[in-house]
């Protein structure tokens, strides 16, 4: 699996979307859960409704969300106030019996709030790019670009 | 196996800039982030900041907000810290490292270290 | 910024004695808390990451505890290799910020 960078400003919320074939994954409950470690196990966050017929259902742990539409085969998580702690690997998952498939593996990056108080749209932003694949990416803690500084592209 | 080799040792003048680079090898240097991290003799660690290899955003410790600047060279796989202004009490080992993965921001992964002296 | 004190700043131990040392954080960090080994000339070394969860490769005489804002690093059977410096971090907020050290000598 490719991991896919979103980036977040601390304090505000992100929105991680992670793709799906509905067909596939018919009848399935979701969960979202965070990668301890480089080789450790991925320990569950927040799943979706436990009747599979009402995975529309915004169901949250703590400050985390998880929302699914099966017919659009798109699982969406919201972290809401997002912190520097935040910041990791994490995966989208599909849930049959005990197993579990990977449908995403995501990395979410933490910038820090902007020194000079300037609004979230005015940093620049590369909304969700594919890292290479098979990575194991480290949680990003960041700040935003200062005036002039101008970053170079995603690699993708 | 992963690598961090790190640039030769550097001696400074007050008021110079100095740029020490961290070379990576063994793994794909996009998928981990390069923290910056330096120890005074004799004196404890100091985290001085963070950049993303996968689009150079960074993040800096108050204290060197302006003096500091993280950037990376893909093409080389290449981390650089330049630190300008140097003044004596700059002079330390620095380090790279890269980051676990996991969401804790701990490193197992470090570069041998580069001593900067600054000294007139 | 989040302070950390560690304690003590040193002590003397025999090989096959059990070692403790204490990591306090001036604020909640949960458990993102990770310790370090440092011997002289060398780079740091991690030994547990998440305030509990041993690194790959490091002897399994070496445990971390805590969450909240006290944190405990515990050597069960000092070994030789073992006289070095010993550091907690946090990260979980910015900045990542370290304890003073803990430097482990032979007594």
């Known amino acids: 699996h490719n991991t896919t960078v979103f980036q977040g400003v601390a304090g505000q919320s992100l929105q991680v979307s992670c793709p799906y074939d509905s067909m596939k994954h018919w009848g399935r409950r979701k969960a979202w859960c965070r990668q301890l470690g480089e080789k450790g196990p991925c320990q569950r966050v927040v799943s979706t409704h436990n009747l599979w017929l009402l995975s529309f259902l915004r169901r949250w742990n703590g400050s985390t969300a998880i929302t699914d539409d099966t017919l659009g085969g798109t699982l969406t998580i919201t972290l809401r106030n997002l912190q520097p702690h935040d910041a990791g690997l994490y995966q989208c998952q599909s849930l049959h019996g005990s197993e579990a498939d990977t449908l995403r593996k995501v990395l979410v990056e933490v910038l820090a709030d902007p020194l000079d108080h300037r609004d979230a749209g005015d940093l620049w932003f590369p909304g969700e790019s594919e890292s290479f694949e098979d990575a194991h990416v480290e949680h990003s803690i960041s700040r935003s670009l200062l005036e002039g500084e101008i970053p170079f592209p995603p690699t993708s | 196996q992963v690598q961090l080799v790190q640039s030769g040792a550097e001696v400074k003048k007050p008021g110079a800039s100095v740029k020490v680079s961290c070379k990576a090898s063994g793994y794909t240097f996009t998928s981990y982030g390069i923290s910056w991290v330096r120890q005074a003799p004799g004196q404890g660690l100091e985290w001085m900041g963070w950049i993303s290899t996968y689009n150079g955003n960074t993040n800096y410790a108050q204290k060197l907000q302006g003096r500091v600047t993280m950037t990376t060279d893909t093409s080389t796989s290449t981390a650089y810290m330049e630190l300008r202004s140097l003044r004596s009490d700059d002079t330390a080992v620095y380090y790279c490292?890269?980051?676990?993965?996991?969401?804790?921001?701990?490193?197992?992964?470090w570069g041998q270290g580069t001593l900067v002296t600054v000294s007139s | 910024d989040i302070q950390m004190t560690q304690s003590p700043s040193s002590l003397s131990a025999s090989v096959g004695d059990r070692v403790t040392i204490t990591c306090r954080a001036s604020?909640?960090?949960?458990?993102?808390l990770n310790w370090y080994q440092q011997k002289p000339g060398k780079a740091p070394k991690l030994l547990i990451y998440a305030a509990s969860s041993l690194q790959s490769g490091v002897p399994s005489r070496f445990s971390g505890s805590g969450s909240g804002t006290d944190f405990t690093l515990t050597i069960s059977s000092l070994q030789p290799e073992d006289f070095a410096t010993y550091y907690c971090q946090q990260s979980y907020d910015f900045p990542i910020t370290f304890g003073g050290g803990t430097k482990v000598e032979i007594k």
């Open positions: 490292a890269r980051g676990s993965g996991s969401g804790y921001d701990s490193w197992y992964d």
């Open positions: 604020q909640s960090i949960s458990s993102y």
